[in-house]
Interface confidence: low
């Protein structure tokens, strides 16, 4: 059977396409190529007479076509108007005509796209931003890249307008980008220059570094404050509530114990109008502080199960410490009946149950030291079984 094949099927505008013919019959008088899906003399491109090896252009001939003795047709410098069907009719020596139809698609060489934005300076958690990939072209696939990666699945990212528009709902500081759009068709692809968002945010709660709390007398105290912010935050320092200076770094040489106190960093963003502060305690001492052993006390050490409650108290004279509780090597609280209060100094169990019997201890700690109390044993007794009617005998 006579067939035709386009090489290539997808053609870039300005390139050439060869309409190859397969299974061409042996005994032929000639053949003709027509534009379209049927034989139409008004749309004949070229006719070829085998006996004379003469090619005759038809009404649809553009001067860019070349026919070969094997019936293949070369079309050069194709345009998008050349897209479509082409029909070959062969006139066999038995005068039986045979036809075959093929097709190809011409796509433009895509230009370098660009990104337009409705808001290039959005405010975090407030503004939405719509990016549009230009230009709008037919038969084009629009792809988006964020940080050189394809779009993540996110409810905050919406595509519309045939994927030509990317909308970021409620931008965050992590949405800075860069953003790129890519346009693709079967014969070409092109990517835009990257576009970044200047997301206004912050300041976040400042961080004071280094994290050290304890310093030796005679050392230099150099504190640096940083709060994530765009535009960058303006900083100021207070010591024990008294304003010191408007700098990001605070430097005090040759400190003494009198420099112990509360150091406050204040961060301000003039664009968002937001302020944040962080307070750091500085302790100037020669010693590497050692937390003393805490004392543990119980309101009672023998209780009645399902009836009594008990309070365990962890006592320490140390300051600047944290407290945690342990029961059978497990961290507490471990059930809804256990409550911590007064800065974790008190552990309350209400009501006490059989499984609460055992050894309890508390631990006090600061960033560089910790110590544990002696264990305390909680005994849980049960009275005689209650009466079925819920009343005591008597």
């Amino acid at each position: 059977q006579l067939t035709t094949e386009s090489m290539p099927f997808n053609v870039a505008e300005g390139k050439e396409v060869l309409l190859l013919v397969h299974n061409l019959p042996q005994q032929l008088f000639g053949y003709s190529w027509y534009k379209g899906e049927r034989v139409d003399g008004n749309r004949q491109i070229v006719g070829y007479a085998i006996g004379t090896q003469q090619a005759t252009p038809g009404p649809a001939n553009s001067g860019r076509e070349t026919i070969y003795p094997n019936a293949s047709l070369l079309i050069q410098n194709v345009t998008q108007n050349d897209t479509g069907f082409y029909t070959l009719q062969v006139i066999k020596s038995d005068l039986v005509n045979e036809e075959a139809t093929g097709q190809f698609h011409v796509y433009p060489e895509l230009p370098k796209p660009s990104i337009s934005s409705n808001n290039s300076n959005p405010v975090e958690d407030k503004d939405a931003v719509a990016f549009t990939c230009e230009p709008e072209t037919q038969d084009t696939t629009y792809l988006w890249w964020i940080n050189n990666q394809s779009l993540p699945v996110s409810p905050r990212l919406q595509l519309s307008n045939g994927n030509r528009t990317l909308t970021l709902l409620s931008v965050t500081r992590n949405d800075t980008g860069p953003y790129e759009c890519e346009i693709q068709n079967p014969v070409s692809a092109n990517r835009s220059d990257p576009v970044t968002l200047n997301v206004t945010y912050g300041p976040d709660t400042p961080t004071i570094s280094p994290s050290d709390t304890y310093y030796r007398p005679g050392a230099n105290l150099s504190l640096s404050c940083y709060a994530a912010s765009n535009p960058p935050a303006q900083y100021s320092w207070l010591i024990n509530g008294t304003f010191q200076q408007s700098t990001q770094e605070l430097f005090i040489p040759n400190i003494t114990v009198n420099n112990s106190g509360s150091y406050t960093c204040h961060a301000n963003n003039s664009v968002t109008g937001c302020n944040r502060t962080t307070v750091k305690t500085i302790i100037v001492t020669e010693l590497s502080p050692v937390v003393a052993k805490p004392q543990i006390k119980a309101s009672k050490t023998t209780v009645t199960g399902d009836k009594d409650s008990v309070n365990l108290t962890c006592s320490t004279n140390d300051t600047g410490i944290s407290i945690r509780w342990f029961f059978k090597n497990q961290s507490l609280p471990s059930s809804e009946r256990m409550k911590l209060s007064q800065g974790n100094t008190t552990l309350s169990i209400n009501p006490v149950k059989r499984e609460d019997a055992g050894t309890y201890w508390c631990e006090v700690f600061n960033p560089i030291s910790k110590n544990q109390s002696d264990p305390i044993m909680l005994n849980v007794n049960y009275n005689a079984l209650p009466q079925e009617n819920g009343l005591s005998p008597g």
Epitope: T285, E286, L287, S288, V290, K370, Q372
Partner: antibody, heavy 121, light 111 residues
């Protein structure tokens, strides 16, 4: 090169006294907590005492409390161990050792070669 | 008796992997960093592992440390004859306010 060189060991009678020294070089001595660790003949290691880099914080093993005193002279890059009321069980090789963590995660990265203290009548 | 418990001896043939354990309590290993020391015969101890699992610079990666709860262990892979030594674990003890060592493990490389 970090070096710790102990000296002052020797034979002493029970109840007697001895002062060990540890000369440090190759590092900023005043930046490190220092310890004394001892090892009785054929036995394992036993920590004796630690002193903070500034000398203000000191701890002792229970076995030596009240008899041994640790001290340091940062201007001389030297660590000391004053040993009083010595007992036969104090017989050991005494090592000085450097703690690079200022005592916050105690470990001993450099040790001296040790000095032998023998308490015997 | 040592606060930290180690097996008194361990052995292996060259190329083998040997593990030395060290058991303590919440006041030492459980809440503080563990170090491992090697003492070759007639020499001062030498630090191998600190902060539970960090190798001191220059220590071969055949030595590795780990910790779980109140126990720690030192693993030596690709055992060599020069690894024959005494090995000690150590940690700060918050209750005693002092540094404690294990009793030491004598490692013998057989063959």
């Amino acid at each position: 090169e970090v070096q710790l060189l102990e000296s002052g060991g020797g034979l002493v009678q029970p109840g007697g006294s001895l002062r060990l020294s540890c000369a440090a070089s190759g590092f900023t001595f005043s930046n490190y907590a220092m310890s004394w660790v001892r090892q009785a003949p054929g036995k394992g290691l036993e920590w004796v005492s630690v002193i903070s880099h500034g000398g203000g914080s000191i701890y002792y093993a229970d076995s030596v409390k009240g008899r041994l005193t640790i001290s340091r002279d940062n201007s001389k890059n030297t660590l000391y161990l004053q040993m009083n009321s010595l007992r036969a069980e104090d017989t050991a090789v005494y090592y000085c050792a450097r703690d690079p963590t200022k005592g916050y995660a105690p470990t001993f990265d450099y040790w001296g070669q040790g000095t032998l203290v023998t308490v015997s009548s | 008796q040592s606060v930290l418990t180690q097996p008194p001896s361990a052995s292996g043939t060259p190329g083998q992997r040997v593990t030395i354990s060290c058991s303590g309590s919440s006041s030492n290993i459980g809440n503080n960093y563990v170090s491992w020391y090697q003492q070759l015969p007639g020499t001062a101890p030498k630090l191998l592992i600190y902060a539970d699992s960090k190798r001191l610079s220059g220590v071969p990666d055949r030595f590795s440390g780990s910790k779980s709860g109140t126990s720690a262990s030192l693993a030596i892979s690709g055992l060599r004859s020069e690894d024959e030594a005494d090995y000690y674990c150590g940690a700060w003890d918050g209750r005693l306010n002092g540094y404690v060592f294990g009793g030491g493990t004598k490692l013998t490389v057989l063959g």
